[in-house]
C-alpha cells in the first residue's frame, strides 16, 4: 500500500516463506520458487530500451524493509510491491510503472538528461 | 511446552493406503511449517516434505511426491500425511517434526509396518 | 540433492573426553539470504531425535554449553568439550538451505 509516495514492508513471518521468482532466482531456488526470512517482491522497471521488464523473488530480511518502500529515484521509472502474507503472494502483485514526468519526455531518438 | 503426538505404530497390508496424524498443541500451529522425515534402519533420516497450515502450501521430495500426500486440520492443530500403494520398502518409523528456519520439535514417530 | 558426508561413523570416546564430529556437504550451505543452515541433532535409542545445534553456531534452549558447533561454506564440525554418559548416541547433521533437505549418516558416539 502507498501512502505520499512510498509503501511500507509488511511484517516478516517467524517462518520461512516461499515466493515465485522470475529473473531473479538464487541458486538455491527450486522450480522457480526461492525461499526466504523476509519478503516476496514483484518489480516492474524500464529496460535501457524503455520497454517494461518484470522481475520477482526474494527479498532477505536483511535491508528489506527499505528495499520494498520503493522510494522514487530520479530519471528511473521503477515500482516494486512486497508481501508476506502466504506463501507465493506475490504472484498476486501488480506494481505499475509511476507516470511519466514531463521532463522525462524526449523530441527525438536522442535522451536529453 | 511444544508437543507433537503421533500413534505410536500402523500395521497395513501391502498395497493399501495409511493415514499417519501428528497432533500439535503448545504453540500456534499456523506460525510454523510442518515436515515428516522417514528413518528406516540402517537407512539414516529422509526429508519427505512440509505443509504450512496457514495456507496449506506444500513443498515435496522428488522422490515422494505420488507417495506421500500432506495435508492439516488447522481446527484441531493436526496434520496428516497419506501414503498410498503401500509396499514393505515403506516400512520404516515416520516422524513429524516442527519447522520454521529449522526442525526444532519433533514427534515421537510412528511405526509404519507393511506386511501381509 | 545436496550429500551431506559426515564422519567418523563411529566415535569411542572415555568420559570427560572432548569429542568432534565433521559433517561436508555437496555444495556450500550460505543461502541466498546469507544464513547458513546447517543443524546438529541428537537421537538416542528409540527416542525422536533433539536439536542441539541451529544455523552452525547457535545452542538451542537448554543444550549444555559444553555442546558448540563451528565452520562456514561446506565443511562444518560439532564439539562436544566434556562427554557425559548422557551424550551418548547417534549425531546428526542436516541442511535446510538447498530443496530436498538432507541430513547426514550420523555418528555413534559410544563407550570405549
Known amino acids: 500500500k502507498k501512502e505520499d509516495g512510498e509503501s511500507t514492508a509488511p511484517t516478516p513471518r517467524p517462518k520461512i516463506l516461499r515466493c515465485k521468482c522470475h529473473h531473479h532466482c538464487p541458486e538455491d531456488s527450486v522450480n522457480n520458487i526461492c525461499s526466504t526470512d523476509g519478503y516476496c517482491f514483484t518489480m516492474i522497471e524500464e529496460d535501457d530500451s524503455g520497454m517494461p521488464v518484470v522481475t520477482s523473488g526474494c527479498l532477505g530480511l536483511e535491508g528489506s524493509d527499505f528495499q520494498c518502500r520503493d522510494t522514487p529515484i530520479p530519471h528511473q521509472r521503477r515500482s516494486i510491491e512486497c508481501c508476506t502474507e502466504r506463501n507465493e503472494c506475490n504472484k498476486d502483485l501488480h506494481p505499475t510503472l509511476p507516470p511519466l514526468k514531463n521532463r522525462d519526455f524526449v523530441d527525438g531518438p536522442i535522451h536529453h538528461k | 511446552q511444544v508437543q507433537l503426538q503421533q500413534p505410536g505404530a500402523e500395521v497395513v497390508k501391502p498395497g493399501a493406503s495409511v493415514k499417519l496424524s501428528c497432533k500439535a498443541s503448545g504453540y500456534t500451529f499456523t506460525n510454523y511449517w510442518m515436515q515428516w522425515v522417514k528413518q528406516r534402519p540402517g537407512q539414516g533420516l529422509e526429508w519427505i516434505g512440509e505443509i504450512d497450515p496457514s495456507d496449506r502450501y506444500t513443498m515435496y521430495n522428488q522422490k515422494f511426491k505420488g507417495k506421500a500426500t500432506l495435508i492439516v486440520d488447522t481446527s484441531s492443530s493436526t496434520a496428516y500425511m497419506q501414503l498410498s500403494s503401500l509396499t514393505s520398502e515403506d516400512s520404516a518409523v515416520y516422524f513429524c517434526a516442527r519447522f520454521g528456519y529449522y526442525v526444532d520439535y519433533w514427534g515421537q514417530g510412528t511405526t509404519l509396518t507393511v506386511s501381509s | 540433492d545436496v550429500v551431506m558426508t559426515q564422519t567418523p561413523l563411529s566415535l569411542p570416546v572415555s568420559l570427560g573426553d572432548q569429542a568432534s564430529i565433521s559433517c561436508r556437504s555437496s555444495?556450500?550451505?550460505?543461502?541466498?539470504?546469507?544464513?547458513?543452515?546447517l543443524h546438529w541433532y541428537l537421537q538416542k535409542p528409540g527416542q525422536s531425535p533433539n536439536l542441539l545445534i541451529y544455523?552452525?553456531?547457535n545452542r538451542f534452549s537448554g543444550v549444555p554449553d559444553r555442546f558448540s558447533g563451528s565452520g562456514s561454506g561446506t565443511d562444518f564440525t560439532l564439539k562436544i568439550s566434556r562427554v557425559e554418559a548422557e551424550d551418548l548416541g547417534v549425531y546428526f547433521c542436516?541442511?535446510?538451505?538447498?530443496?530436498?533437505?538432507?541430513f547426514g549418516s550420523g555418528t555413534k558416539l559410544e563407550i570405549k
Open positions: 555444495q556450500s550451505l550460505v543461502h541466498s539470504t546469507g544464513n547458513t543452515y
Open positions: 544455523k552452525v553456531s
Open positions: 542436516s541442511q535446510s538451505t538447498h530443496v530436498p533437505f538432507t
